[in-house]
């Protein structure tokens, strides 16, 4: 399978997740109880497959509304957790461009 054009990966993925999830933070692998199918992890989902805003939202650490699922503990950080300072240099325009591209 070849990578489709509408993918997000690398720093652009981290930037876009930071924008979409805001101060909720995000998981690098979705808690299994939050999805009907087996979670592949965001790298598998977004780096190689078409990745949209709805999919990105499922990786946010807390639901956007108040119905937080307290039965779902945060996942343990994998050993591929990024060394970059996530969100340290907030550049709204960069994230806005990425999310606009995903909406198309």
């Amino acid at each position: 399978a070849y990578r489709p054009s509408e993918t997000l990966c690398g720093g652009e993925l981290v930037d876009t997740l930071q924008f979409v999830c805001g101060d909720r933070g995000f998981y690098f692998s979705r808690p299994a109880s939050r999805v009907s199918r087996r979670s592949r992890g965001i790298v598998e989902e977004c780096c190689f497959r078409s990745c949209d805003l709805a999919l990105l939202e499922t990786y946010c650490a807390t639901p956007a509304k108040s119905e937080r699922d307290v039965s779902t503990p945060p996942t343990v950080l994998p050993d591929n957790f990024p060394r970059y300072p996530v969100g340290k240099f907030f550049q709204y325009d960069t994230w806005k461009q990425s999310t606009q591209r995903l909406r198309r």
């Epitope: 399978a1 060394r83 970059y84």
Partner: antibody, heavy 119, light 108 residues
Framework: EVQLLESGGGLVQPGGSLRLSCAAS????????MTWVRQAPGKGLEWVSS????????VYADSVKGRFTISRDNSKNTLYLQMNSLRAEDTAVYYC????????????WGQGTMVTVSS | DIQMTQSPSSLSASVGDRVTITCRAS??????LNWYQQKPGKAPKLLIY???KLEDGVPSRFSGSGTGTDFTLTIRSLQPEDFASYFC??????????FGPGTKVEIK
Amino acid sequence: EVQLLESGGGLVQPGGSLRLSCAASGFTFSAYIMTWVRQAPGKGLEWVSSISPSGGYTVYADSVKGRFTISRDNSKNTLYLQMNSLRAEDTAVYYCARDSGFGDPFDYWGQGTMVTVSS
Amino acid sequence: DIQMTQSPSSLSASVGDRVTITCRASQSIRNYLNWYQQKPGKAPKLLIYAASKLEDGVPSRFSGSGTGTDFTLTIRSLQPEDFASYFCQQSYSSPGITFGPGTKVEIK
């Protein structure tokens, strides 16, 4: 300690085939995108191909598309590159590297394996 | 695809010199820029990541700066072991990470 060890290089005639391997240890292999990078003699570094953590998805540089196939065996912590229809311009040192998918650098490299395509 | 350019392609310098290498991206990559050193017959070695963060074990005479599209690697006081090739790499968009063409630092 993270280690990547490439093997399988050698001398092959144009049109021939080779299979490179990269044995990984010291990290959770199945969590990473794995990548092949090559360097022709006296030239710069060129990305060749990458494979998703599960092995279900692949992507290739235009220069090798249709000729090279990347694969992995997560049970053996090993990455492969099947190289067919080799050309003189494929002559290079081939390196494997791990990619977190989160914008990290390639912090560990193997020693590389030399592929020479010549008649 | 994001294209990376580097300048100069080569330079001659003496031990103790201050050396500056520049790298430019074809679009903004924020701070997702890494620098590597490579000596003949060896694999590349990570020097700096996230544009300015020094990798563990790398001497403090190496420094990096920049954000967006323009980046700089500086060697404050060139040492004999620093004569090598240097490559920049963007990791803002991956897979398909791209490298600069390299800068060869030679002895004057």
